[in-house]
């Protein structure tokens, strides 16, 4: 197991998941570990603890490992990290990867207020509704802001979007979390149609292919004003 | 569906050696990484030995230089050899598998695994 040494390290690897951060309980995740050519060993570590380790054949000159999860579930989700090694130095850490599972216990109810079809300038709220109890909502828009709202609540929640903009259109999902990194299933989509304005065209998203597993977003939190979370823009996480 | 049994505990005396197996059903043996837990009475299930599916091995500290992990790839079966037993061995060994892996990883932490045997009980006693 590696052991921290302050004085040398080597520079932090990049990490990041294919084909997502957000993956359906049961389904598979790879985690990516990007080093240094000379590297010897890979470890990645989840919330703290040792999880796995890579060592590269000599033979295959590679600066990156695949760490493999079989099975997503709640027990997997959280905080993963990756360190490499190389001769007697190991690297700093990389920056964290937050993985969330989805898919678990029930399906929200989401919709759009006054309607899913408005005018340029005008208010829309969307409430997420979950039977079953739960601490926080999320709301993500598909391929659209990558932007991601979360709101405390038992049963519901809503996401007041002010005066719509252009930018607001696209397809939006919600889900209820049981903690930041179990998920419910998510909502049926709800695609927010802008009309009036300049360009008069209430066209939804061009790509009805969207899909979770192809989700890219940031993660923030509209309590404090808007604190961005790294770890969730794109899949990769790098400085 | 992997099926995992294991075989070979019991009782031995301290400085004694013991040789566990863990029987896989199915064919995916091949492609799996496997590992050796172990949980002794009122303490946390511990990761003990690893090894993947092209045959790197880890250790917890606490086994290494006295435990062994291999593989028998044509017979379905890991094996976990180990000597200069002492009391704290004592404790329910469990094989695990992770199905299917790749590459060379091999896992350290249960989470990651998702096939489980019923365990397999040793003893160290005078």
């Known amino acids: 197991q590696r052991i921290n040494t302050e004085k040398e390290t080597l520079p932090k690897p990049i990490i990041w998941a294919k084909p997502s951060i957000m993956v359906t309980n049961g389904n598979s995740v790879n985690i990516w570990c990007q080093g240094a050519q000379s590297a010897s060993e890979y470890q990645l570590y989840f919330e703290g603890s040792f999880f796995a380790l890579e060592r590269p054949k000599p033979s295959r000159s590679m600066n990156k490992v695949r760490f493999f999860i079989s099975q997503m579930t709640s027990h997997t989700a959280g905080i993963y990290t990756c360190f490499y090694q190389s001769g007697e130095l190991w690297s700093k850490s990389s920056n964290p990867l937050k993985l969330v599972v989805t898919g678990l216990y029930d399906t929200p109810n989401l919709w759009v207020y006054p309607r899913p079809e408005v005018t340029l300038g005008e208010n829309v709220t969307f409430f997420c509704q979950l039977k079953t109890a739960t601490s926080k909502f999320f709301l993500l828009k598909e391929r659209g802001s990558n932007h991601i709202q979360n709101k405390y609540g038992n049963i519901q929640a809503e996401f007041p979007m002010g005066p719509v903009t252009r930018a607001h259109r696209g397809t939006y999902r919600c889900f209820g979390s049981y903690n930041d990194y179990a998920w419910s299933f998510p909502s049926e989509p709800v695609t927010l149609l802008i009309t009036g304005g300049v360009e008069n065209s209430s066209l939804a998203p061009t790509d009805p292919t969207s899909s979770l597993d192809y989700w890219e977003f940031d993660l923030s939190t509209n309590e404090s004003g808007l604190q961005k979370d790294s770890a969730f823009w794109d899949h990769t996480t790098q400085n | 569906e992997v099926q995992l049994v294991e075989s070979g505990g019991g009782e031995v005396q301290p400085g004694g050696s013991l040789r566990l197996s863990c029987a896989a059903s199915g064919r995916t043996f091949a492609s799996a990484a496997m590992g050796w837990f172990r949980q002794a009475p009122g303490k946390e299930r511990e990761f003990v030995a690893a090894i993947s599916r092209s045959d790197d091995t880890y250790y917890a500290e606490s086994v290494k230089g006295r435990f062994t992990i291999s593989r028998d790839n044509a017979k379905n079966t890991v094996y976990l050899q180990m000597s200069s037993l002492r009391a704290e061995d004592t404790a329910v060994y469990y094989c695990?598998?992770?199905?299917?892996?790749?590459?060379?990883?091999?896992?350290?932490?249960?989470?990651?695994?998702?096939?489980w045997g019923q365990g397999t009980l040793v003893t160290v006693k005078p």
């Open positions: 695990a598998a992770v199905v299917p892996t790749y590459g060379n990883t091999i896992y350290v932490h249960s989470a990651a695994y998702n096939y």
